[in-house]
Interface confidence: medium
């Protein structure tokens, strides 16, 4: 019988409210044996895959997606899925990244910790269609 794949979780370090120009790392977590983690942007518009998967604990693997210098266009909704042969998982919940005007410099600690994992299958179809794109930044050619 095919194994049931647990939903991945997503979190952001150092948090989900990031000053302009600072860095953020999305952390996707799933079970051991994951081959590929995928970080998706907004309503499955664009994505980034990595096979650079490490073991976070005896029962968990993770992948990290880093944005070195956050711009306004990086604001938005992110989620993770993973591929554990021969199946793709369901999606994690969405995590919203907010970008704010820098006040205390790149190392300013004014960020909020953020993570997203939960029992719901996927957000209801109205949960993210009010989020309009940021006015500038992210090029259509790249996830970030």
């Amino acid at each position: 019988q095919e194994e049931d794949l647990p939903r991945p979780s997503i979190s952001a370090e150092p948090g989900t409210v990031i000053p302009l120009g600072s860095h953020v790392t999305f952390v996707c977590r799933g079970p051991v044996g994951v081959q590929t983690f995928r970080l998706e942007r907004d309503s499955r518009s664009t994505y980034n895959d990595t096979e650079d998967v490490s073991q976070a604990s005896p029962s968990e693997s993770e992948a990290r997606f880093r944005i070195d210098s956050v711009r306004e266009g990086n604001a938005g909704l992110y989620r993770c899925i993973y591929y554990k042969p021969p199946k793709w998982s369901e999606q994690s919940d969405y995590l919203e990244l907010l970008v704010k005007e820098s006040s205390g410099g790149p190392d300013s600690p004014d960020t909020e910790p953020g993570s997203s994992a939960g029992p719901t299958q996927r957000p209801s179809d109205n949960s993210h269609n009010e989020h309009a794109p940021a006015s500038q930044g992210l090029k259509a050619e790249h996830l970030y």
Partner: antibody, heavy 122, light 107 residues
Framework: EVQLQQSGPEVLKPGASVKISCKAS?????????MNWVKQSHGKSLEWIGY????????SYNQKFKGKATLTVDKSSSTAYMELRSLTSEDSAVYYC??????????????WGQGTSVTVSS | DVQMIQSPSSLSASLGDIVTMTCQAS??????LNWFQQKPGKAPKLLIY???NLEDGVPSRFSGSRYGTDFTLTISSLEDEDMATYFC?????????FGGGTKLEIK
């Protein structure tokens, strides 16, 4: 070769319901692909109705088609369905199923069915 | 909803011409923009995804570009078989929305 084979044309009376099918072949139906449904009224543009994720049946609808369209799948036969209810002349159109594929970091409707014509007439 | 304003609604050009058509998004630049070609009685066919990526098997005379919220489809040397209607699609924000279409005719 990926193929989406839709059911044949339908002529129906106002108030009736219809269930259109879209049989997928050439790829793993329950892999990470979504199935979209798109409406094209005569000589007009395209409208996205909604999508369904065959893996778990999760759906997302265009608000405009909520209550009008219901999307379902039968994993055993790799078939997606769209039911339209309480039909009026406004529902007369060609309806397409279209797979959401992914390529080079983008999602897109890469394969389309041939379309199913629905005519509502008294 | 993100509206996609496509122009012109129709155009006529000669074989060998350079042809351009545009879609303007009502908001946002972070859009995965797709272009489709549709011939009468047929389903739409994917040409371009991610604003500028050419789908496999599509002739290289087709290209896509983006400037801000404006997206352009260019046919570098028009051929007979290009007579069709072209649609753009924003595939980022729900509900996904299509442009109104550009009907291309050969002079």
């Amino acid at each position: 070769e990926v193929q989406l084979q839709q059911s044949g044309p339908e002529v129906l009376k106002p108030g009736a319901s219809v269930k259109i099918s879209c049989k997928a072949s050439g790829y793993t139906f329950t892999d990470y692909y979504y199935m979209n449904w798109v409406k094209q009224s005569h000589g007009k543009s395209l409208e996205w109705i909604g999508y369904i994720y065959p893996n778990n049946g999760a759906t997302s609808y265009n608000q405009k088609f909520k209550g009008k369209a219901t999307l379902t799948v039968d994993k055993s036969s790799s078939t997606a369905y769209m039911e339209l209810r309480s039909l009026t002349s406004e529902d007369s159109a060609v309806y397409y199923c279209a797979r959401d594929g992914y390529s080079s970091n983008y999602y897109t409707m890469d394969y389309w069915g041939q379309g199913t014509s629905v005519t509502v007439s008294s | 909803d993100v509206q996609m304003i496509q122009s012109p609604s129709s155009l006529s050009a000669s074989l060998g011409d350079i042809v351009t058509m545009t879609c303007q998004a009502s908001q946002g630049t972070s859009i995965n923009l797709n272009w489709f070609q549709q011939k009468p009685g047929k389903a739409p066919k994917l040409l371009i995804y991610g604003a500028s990526n050419l789908e496999d098997g599509v002739p290289s005379r087709f290209s896509g570009s983006r400037y801000g919220t404006d997206f352009t489809l260019t046919i570098s040397s028009l051929e007979d078989e290009d007579m069709a209607t072209y649609f753009c699609l924003q595939h980022t924000y729900l509900p996904y929305t299509f442009g109104g279409g550009t009907k291309l005719e050969i002079k």
